[in-house]
């Protein structure tokens, strides 16, 4: 007796974070025995879509010509072979940016900071929002969420970094969002360049400090601990 069919691989091109109006292609790759591919979207009646495989039958393409709010969400795909349906793929979270106006990102006291000192990145939105995200360019896991505790709406979120090391240097952007959909984000803020000067220390602060970073800026996101003072926001990893 053969075991369950292996799960397919699901991904999006050019990526899973798409600006409103832009096109995106969702790919599902199974096996050469696949006869049909099915794409399901969380909280929608299934199947969300269905496609015949492309030669040599080991994958299928689901095209979204123009990204809108309706397409944002969590997807899984399956394929059908002569022996039945596969296990579901790991989920793909398709996020749309451009749902709200862009926030402003600033650094306090300054974007030029000496190594070992403290800096706070401040993300401010014009209208009250309950989720703020900080993105660092070229980070493998770039999303850091600050979410309000009880759905309370905030105009800003603070991302404190202390002590600062060379690892923290780089280009940041932030987004704001409403909690009713984690998949709808604002336009990105203008980029903020954080410049760390006078770095003489080992850029690997001990994990007991309030902000820890791993081997380098390409490897890990910022990982703050504890709650944000006076903001009513709570840190979450999604």
């Amino acid at each position: 007796q053969a075991g369950p069919l292996p799960k397919p691989t699901l991904w999006a091109e050019p990526g899973s974070v798409i600006s409103w109006g832009n096109s995106v292609t969702i790919w599902c790759q199974g096996t050469l025995e696949a006869r049909e591919y099915r794409l399901d979207k969380e909280e929608s009646p299934a199947p969300w879509d269905r496609q015949n495989p492309l030669e040599p039958k080991n994958k299928a393409r689901f095209s979204i010509p123009s990204m809108t709010e309706d397409y944002a969400g969590r997807y899984r795909c399956y394929y059908r072979s002569p022996v039945g349906w596969s296990q579901p793929s790991d989920p793909l979270e398709l996020v749309m940016t451009g749902a709200y106006s862009k926030p402003t990102l600033s650094a306090l006291p300054s974007p030029l900071v000496t190594s070992g000192k403290s800096v706070t990145l401040l993300c401010q939105s014009r209208s009250p929002m309950d989720t703020f995200l900080l993105i660092k360019e070229r980070a493998a896991h770039p999303l850091l969420h600050l979410r309000s505790e009880h759905g309370a709406q905030q105009h800003q979120a603070e991302f404190p970094m202390s002590p600062v090391t060379s690892v923290h240097g780089g280009t940041y952007r932030c987004f704001s969002s409403h909690g009713f959909s984690h998949y709808l984000l604002s336009h990105p803020s203008d980029p903020l360049e954080l410049i760390v000067s006078g770095s003489l220390e080992d850029p690997r602060p001990s994990p007991t400090r309030s902000v820890s970073t791993a081997a380098g800026p390409e490897d890990q996101p910022l990982m703050p601990t504890g709650s944000v003072p006076h903001s009513g926001l709570r840190r979450h990893w999604e």
């Epitope: 399901d40 009646p45 879509d49």
Partner: nanobody
Framework: EVQVVESGGGLVQAGGSLRLSCAAS????????MGWYRQAHGKQRELVAA???????KYADSVKGRFTISRDNAKNTVYLQMNSLNVEDTAVYYC???????????????WGQGTQVTVSS
């Protein structure tokens, strides 16, 4: 060959109830979203309710709390239980089957012939 067939329409007084049925072939029923649209005279066809093979259901705001969609997998049949009917519910009701992506675009893969529901005051 008609692959989706509705029944159960008729004339009912305002405040009354009706149950529509839609029978489909096993192949269509087991692999598609099943749902109901309606089209009133001179108006655009609108999605009323739908149910997926995963059990997720969707309703138009105008029928929430009054209409219930259900599917009987043993009979390859989908039902629309309509309660507290009002004059505005008067329309031809169409059963449909297809993927959800097309459902929301009012272009499912399979359509029934339609059954008339008339609600009198």
């Amino acid at each position: 060959e008609v692959q989706v067939v509705e029944s159960g329409g008729g004339l009912v007084q305002a405040g009354g109830s009706l149950r529509l049925s839609c029978a489909a072939s096993e192949t269509i029923f087991s692999s598609n979203v099943m749902g109901w649209y309606r089209q009133a005279h001179g108006k655009q066809r609108e999605l009323v309710a739908a149910t997926g093979i995963n059990g997720v259901t969707k309703y138009a705001d105008s029928v929430k709390g009054r209409f219930t969609i259900s599917r009987d997998n043993a009979k390859n049949t989908v039902y629309l239980q309509m309660n507290s009917l009002n004059v505005e519910d008067t329309a031809v009701y169409y059963c449909a089957a297809g993927v959800w992506r097309n459902f929301v675009m009012r272009s499912p893969d399979y359509w029934g012939q339609g059954t008339q529901v008339t609600v009198s005051s």
